[in-house]
Interface confidence: low
Amino acid sequence: IWELKKDVYVVELDWYPDAPGEMVVLTCDTPEEDGITWTLDQSSEVLGSGKTLTIQVKEFGDAGQYTCHKGGEVLSHSLLLLHKKEDGIWSTDILKDQKEPKNKTFLRCEAKNYSGRFTCWWLTTISTDLTFSVKSSRGSSDPQGVTCGAATLSAERVRGDNKEYEYSVECQEDSACPAAEESLPIEVMVDAVHKLKYENYTSSFFIRDIIKPDPPKNLQLKPLKNSRQVEVSWEYPDTWSTPHSYFSLTFCVQVQGKSKREKKDRVFTDKTSATVICRKNASISVRAQDRYYSSSWSEWASVPCS
Amino acid sequence: RNLPVATPDPGMFPCLHHSQNLLRAVSNMLQKARQTLEFYPCTSEEIDHEDITKDKTSTVEACLPLELTKNESCLNSRETSFITNGSCLASRKTSFMMALCLSSIYEDLKMYQVEFKTMNAKLLMDPKRQIFLDQNMLAVIDELMQALNFNSETVPQKSSLEEPDFYKTKIKLCILLHAFRIRAVTIDRVMSYLNAS
């Protein structure tokens, strides 16, 4: 048993048929010694008397809010949550496996630049009685500070018969140098509580590996005289790290016909312009990637050819 | 990603081309190591991230773009320990900080060169003959060092009579390649920045 926060405790249970469970001793937070009684949740049934209460926690029925009283007055509460371990593996019932980039990916994180700011998100099909708490640090044995905001519901979508809820959180490394070479990964820890079930999820990454620039901005076409060619130009996204001569991007320019089956023409360039042939009803798209460290490409910025 | 390789103009900052080749070579070598040593911990998640140049050079600090010198987090350990004259910059542009920066890069390359050569000597003794260092990568390190043209005493290659632990050496190779790739990225950024300025 361990304390998650004030008056909230997590009981770790091996979860199998006829498991013996865990013996837990609760102590009433009061100077009083006599006339103390204990109840569970909203029940008025007295479970025991005295300053301490010993219980055998085996299942969710044994979890909940234990309250000690004296003469009708509440003295203190202890909320017991369960953390299930089945076949040596902690349960992951609350969040959905996003399966990207690999199986058992429950948290996904991205950064738009090297400033030390990043966003993590996760998915669940649970809509109520759900709380999340996020902590983060740089390194684990001698952690350096990362400040995370509150997790918020950022999107809802329907998948078949199910509704899926996306939660996200923004974090900022307290003292980040964009040019630094990371040797310790960022650790993100999410505590998830659904009713009386506790689970924790972790992700470990280097900012350099989760970089995904915003799409190039101000994408413009300039037709070239007496030619089917056009000059495409764009700019670095505002959110990208500066100076751009140090944090350079490389770009992919794509000409795509209306039909997805049509052949795509692609050009790679380090410049912020390119000359391409503009076909009728086609569109021109440009995306960006760190020039020197191949993390994710940005989403496409697009303009129609016409 | 296969991008066409641009040939630098004769007037272009001469080290930029070499640093681009360096990053390409170390990335290829790392990819080869990951594939060849698939049963070893060789991915970024599995290895311990070590920097053999730690406390020896200060490349990130010495080569910090001017725009980032206002960022206090970047100035924790700004050192000024390298005063030399490199040939990568036209002399009129060579400032104290630039010389310091290029000298630090040179020292990095020298340290990695020694480590890689020592490691290759061990790998050549492996009866499994599983992996060797790409000679192109070693050559590219050499070329960039020559382009930087700093006078420095040569460090003798570490020789050892003991039977090497080939497992350890291969894990160490992965660690070294990951670290060197990160440093090569920094070097490329620096050269690009100096070229633009």
Epitope: - | P41, E50, S160, P164, Y167, K168, I171
Partner: antibody, heavy 119, light 107 residues
Framework: EVTLRESGPALVKPTQTLTLTCTFS??????????VSWIRQPPGKALEWLAH???????YYNPSLKSRLTISKDTSKNQVVLTMTNMDPVDTATYYC???????????WGQGTTVTVSS | DIVMTQSPDSLAVSLGERATINCKAS??????VAWYQQKPGQPPKLLIY???NRYTGVPDRFSGSGYGTDFTLTISSLQAEDVAVYYC?????????FGGGTKVEIK
């Protein structure tokens, strides 16, 4: 939870062969880069590495004792066996088996077994 | 064989004070050095690997540094439970070798 336990005779006579067994749990020698080492420590003295066996049966020995040592493993039983021939009173020591993992250091140790060589 | 020479042989430090143990390798061992703590009647415990990486669960008052031939283990603020013998070990090359040990006591 990783545990290692050494077993073998507490007393052996000079010139006899010592056989020590390390029984471990919580990890497998089927996993790459896992290995088990034997280390000894004479009373009041420093540690001395004896031998190591890797997951794929590659073996390393301390050259000063190589001719007397044999290390082997039984992966299915989670056991590693060390034999040391021609025992001498100077071989009196606590013998430890240890796991050497990815970190390339002895991260888990058995409690050790004390072996006395005396006639 | 690579010889690991530890100094001093023993060290008496007041509680809360800094304790520093040195280890010198007879040839370069890169950063392939581990540090162990051994209390009487117990097996050694891993503290530091790859010269400067604290092992899981090791208090942050323990730190390691060094590269090549010279290595240091520092206990920034000695606690009563730190009384033990400390060993350095190289696994750069076979045979893996240990230092002679440094006994740390309270002054």
């Amino acid at each position: 939870e990783v545990t290692l336990r050494e077993s073998g005779p507490a007393l052996v006579k000079p010139t006899q062969t010592l056989t020590l067994t390390c029984t471990f749990s919580g990890f497998s020698l089927r996993k790459s880069v896992m290995g088990v080492s034997w280390i000894r420590q004479p009373p009041g003295k420093a540690l001395e590495w004896l031998a190591h066996i890797y997951w794929d049966d590659d073996k390393y020995y301390n050259p000063s004792l190589k001719s007397r040592l044999t290390i082997s493993k039984d992966t299915s039983k989670n056991q590693v066996v060390l034999t040391m021939t021609n025992m001498d009173p100077v071989d009196t020591a606590t013998y430890y088996c240890t796991r050497r993992g990815i970190r390339s250091a002895m991260d888990y140790w058995g409690q050790g077994t004390t072996v006395t060589v005396s006639s | 064989d690579i010889v690991m020479t530890q100094s001093p042989d023993s060290l008496a430090v007041s509680l809360g004070e800094r304790a520093t143990i040195n280890c010198k390798a007879s040839q370069s061992v890169s950063n392939d050095v581990a540090w162990y703590q051994q209390k009487p009647g117990q097996p050694p415990k891993l503290l530091i690997y790859y010269a400067s990486n604290r092992y899981t669960g090791v208090p942050d008052r323990f730190s390691g540094s060094g590269y090549g031939t010279d290595f240091t283990l520092t206990i920034s603020s000695l606690q009563a439970e730190d009384v033990a013998v400390y060993y350095c070990q190289q696994d750069y090359n076979s045979p893996w070798t240990f230092g002679g040990g440094t006994k740390v006591e309270i002054k």
